[in-house]
C-alpha cells in the first residue's frame, strides 16, 4: 500500500504533504487545515492543469471566511512547476489568512505575473524565503512579486537564485526589512552584490548574511554596502574564500559605524584581513587557517573575539582541525 501523502502531527502543529504520484489526490491536503506550519512538496509536478480547474480571476473575497479559519502561520511549497497566474491566485487568497512566513523552494515559475488589481489586498508576510526558484521574467521577478505583498516584510532570504540581481528601477523600497540573506549564491560575487543591493531600497537592514556568495575581500564587500547605502549591524561573510590582502589600487573603504558584528569563520584565512572595521562588538574568526595568534595591531578593537578551530590553537596541526576552543567547547571545523 502506498503511504498517505499527508501527515499531521498529533498536536495539530505540523503537517507535511509529499505528493509523488503522477495524478495526486490534492484533497488529501485538507487534513492540514488545522496545522500551524504546513509543508507541501509536489514531487516536481507541473501545476499547469490546475489553471483549468480554478478561476484565477475569481474574487478572492468569496473565500475570505474559509481562509481566515486556517491556523497556518508558516507555509512551505516546494518541487513544482507553477504558472505565475496560479501563484498570484494563491497569494490573493492567502492575503485573507494568518500566514506570516512563506517559503518557496525548488520551483519553476512560468509566465508573467499580472499587476495587482486596485481592489486587491497584499499578503502581510513578515518573512519570505526563496531557494532555487526560477522565474520566467528574469530580473524583474522581485518587483513583480513585491506588488503582491504588503510593505511590512521583515525577513527576505534568496538562495540558489537563477537571477540574484534585480531590476532595481522597478523594485520599491522595503521599509521594514531588517534581515536580508543572500547566502548560497556562489556566483554572486562582489559585483553581483552591488547589483543585488539596490541603492536605498533596503533602508532598515540590520542583519545581512552573505555566506557562500563568492565574496573575495571584506573591503570589496564594504564598497558594495557603501554604494548601496546599506548599513547593517551584523554581517555574515562566513564560508567564502576570502583574501586577507587588499588590492593596493582599490580605494580604502570606511565601514559604517553601525556595524558591530562580523562573522569571518570558515573563510580560509591564513592571516587577519586588512581593512576591517576599527571597532566591533563581535568578531568571529573561527575555523580559519591562522597559524599564529593575531597581534593586537592586526585586530579591530573588539569585545568578543572567537578564534576557535585555528591551527595555532592546536599544537602539531597546520590546518583547521578539531581542537580546544576559547569557549572550552570542541569546534567541528
Amino acid at each position: 500500500t502506498t503511504p498517505e501523502p499527508c501527515e499531521l502531527d498529533d498536536e495539530d502543529f505540523r503537517c507535511v504533504c509529499n505528493f509523488s504520484e503522477p495524478q495526486p489526490d490534492w484533497s488529501e491536503a485538507f487534513q492540514c487545515v488545522s496545522a500551524v506550519e504546513v509543508e507541501i512538496h509536489a514531487g516536481g509536478l507541473n501545476l499547469e492543469p490546475f489553471l483549468k480547474r480554478v478561476d484565477a480571476d475569481a474574487d478572492p473575497r468569496q473565500y475570505a471566511d474559509t481562509v481566515k479559519a486556517l491556523r497556518v502561520r508558516r507555509l512551505t511549497v516546494g518541487a513544482a512547476q507553477v504558472p505565475a497566474q496560479l501563484l498570484v491566485g494563491a497569494l490573493r487568497v492567502l492575503a485573507y489568512s494568518r500566514l506570516k512566513e512563506l517559503t518557496l523552494e525548488d520551483l519553476k515559475i512560468t509566465g508573467t505575473m499580472p499587476p495587482l488589481p486596485l481592489e486587491a489586498t497584499g499578503l502581510a508576510l513578515s518573512s519570505l524565503r526563496l531557494r532555487n526558484v526560477s522565474w520566467a521574467t528574469g530580473r524583474s521577478w522581485l518587483a513583480e512579486l513585491q506588488q503582491w505583498l504588503k510593505p511590512g516584510l521583515k525577513v527576505l532570504s534568496i538562495a540558489q537564485a537563477h537571477s540574484p540581481a534585480f531590476s532595481c528601477e522597478q523594485v520599491r523600497a522595503f521599509p521594514a526589512l531588517t534581515s536580508l540573506d543572500l547566502s548560497d549564491n556562489p556566483g554572486l560575487g562582489e559585483r553581483g552584490l552591488m547589483a543585488a543591493l539596490c541603492p536605498h531600497k533596503f533602508p532598515a537592514i540590520q542583519n545581512l548574511a552573505l555566506r557562500n556568495t563568492g565574496m573575495e575581500t571584506p573591503t570589496g564587500v564594504c564598497a558594495a554596502l557603501a554604494a548601496a547605502g546599506v548599513q547593517p549591524h551584523s554581517l555574515d561573510l562566513s564560508h567564502n574564500s576570502l583574501r586577507a590582502t587588499v588590492n593596493p589600487s582599490a580605494p580604502r573603504c570606511m565601514w559604517s559605524s553601525a556595524l558591530n558584528s562580523l562573522n569571518l569563520s570558515f573563510a580560509g584565512l591564513e592571516q587577519v584581513p586588512k581593512g576591517l572595521p576599527a571597532k566591533l562588538r563581535v568578531l568571529d574568526l573561527s575555523c580559519n587557517r591562522l597559524n599564529r595568534a593575531p597581534q593586537p595591531d592586526e585586530l579591530p578593537e573588539v569585545d568578543n573575539l572567537t578564534l576557535d578551530g585555528n591551527p595555532f590553537l592546536v599544537p602539531g596541526t597546520a590546518l583547521p582541525h578539531e581542537g580546544s576552543m576559547n569557549s572550552g567547547v570542541v569546534p567541528a571545523c
Epitope: 502543529f13 488545522s34 491556523r71
Partner: antibody
Framework: QVQLQESGPGLVKPSETLSLTCTVS?????????WNWIRQPPGKGLEWIGY???????SYNPSLKSRVTISRDTSKNQFSLKLSSVTAADTAVYYC????????WGQGTLVTVSS | EIVLTQSPATLSLSPGERATLSCRAS??????????LHWYQQKPGQAPRLLIY???NLQSGIPARFSGSGSRTDFTLTISSLEPEDVAVYYC?????????FGQGTKLEIK
C-alpha cells in the same frame, strides 16, 4: 516521555536582561512541535510569552514582543528566553512548555526582579 | 487577541457533587472541525497539568470524571463527582490564534 528543565538566575536587577534556558530530553526541538515560554506572576494567572518552532520560526506575544527573543541551540537540544529592560512587573515563575496544547511543562523557575 | 472569561471566579462544593466550570471566548476558537480550547488544573506550587484538549478530548492519565464540551465561543469543564484532590485553580486556554491566551482561572474549593 518529554521532559523540560528551566535554568537561569533567580534574581535580576531592574533594567537588565532576564536570561533563561530550557533543556529538553526525550524529544528533539528541531524535529517537531512548538517550544514555548509561559510565565505566572505570584498569585496571578498564566501569560504566554512566545514560542520557537521545530523549524526555527518564532511567534511572540505582542505585549512583550519589543523586549523578547527566543532562540535555540539544536546541538544541545535547548531553547532560551531573553527578556530585556525588566521591571518588578516581570517577577514571575517562568515555565518552558512543549506544544500549543501545553501537555508537557517544566517545573518552573521563580525569577525576581529587584535591586 | 482572543479574551477568555471564566466563571465563576470561585466555586465551593462538597465531595461527590458535580462541578461545572464555564469559559467564554470573545470570538470563535474553532478552525473547521476542531475547537482549539484546552483545560488545565493547577495545584499550589505546581506547574499546570493538561486535562482536556480540543474542547472534549481527555488527556491520557487524567481520571474519567473530568470531561469537556462546547464549540465556537462557549465551553464547559465538568467534574462529575468531586474528589478532595480536585482542589485547584482551573484555567482554559485557546490555541486557535496567537497570541495564545488563558482565562483568568476558576478556584475550586471543597466545603
Amino acid at each position: 516521555q518529554v521532559q523540560l528543565q528551566e535554568s537561569g538566575p533567580g534574581l535580576v536587577k531592574p533594567s537588565e536582561t532576564l536570561s533563561l534556558t530550557c533543556t529538553v530530553s526525550g524529544g528533539s526541538i528541531s524535529s517537531d512541535s512548538a517550544w514555548n515560554w509561559i510565565r505566572q506572576p505570584p498569585g496571578k494567572g498564566l501569560e504566554w510569552i512566545g514560542y520557537i518552532s521545530y523549524s526555527g520560526s518564532t511567534s511572540y506575544n505582542p505585549s512583550l514582543k519589543s523586549r523578547v527573543t527566543i532562540s535555540r541551540d539544536t546541538s544541545k537540544n535547548q531553547f532560551s528566553l531573553k527578556l530585556s529592560s525588566v521591571t518588578a512587573a516581570d517577577t514571575a515563575v517562568y515555565y518552558c512548555v512543549r506544544g500549543l496544547r501545553f501537555a508537557y511543562w517544566g517545573q518552573g523557575t521563580l525569577v525576581t526582579v529587584s535591586s | 487577541e482572543i479574551v477568555l472569561t471564566q466563571s465563576p471566579a470561585t466555586l465551593s462544593l462538597s465531595p461527590g457533587e458535580r462541578a461545572t466550570l464555564s469559559c467564554r471566548a470573545s470570538e470563535s476558537v474553532d478552525s473547521y472541525v476542531n475547537s482549539f480550547l484546552h483545560w488545565y488544573q493547577q495545584k499550589p506550587g505546581q506547574a499546570p497539568r493538561l486535562l482536556i484538549y480540543r474542547a472534549s478530548n481527555l488527556q491520557s492519565g487524567i481520571p474519567a470524571r473530568f470531561s469537556g464540551s462546547g464549540s465556537r465561543t462557549d465551553f464547559t469543564l465538568t467534574i462529575s463527582s468531586l474528589e478532595p484532590e480536585d482542589v485547584a485553580v482551573y484555567y482554559c486556554q485557546q490555541s486557535n490564534e496567537d497570541p495564545y491566551t488563558f482565562g483568568q482561572g476558576t478556584k475550586l474549593e471543597i466545603k
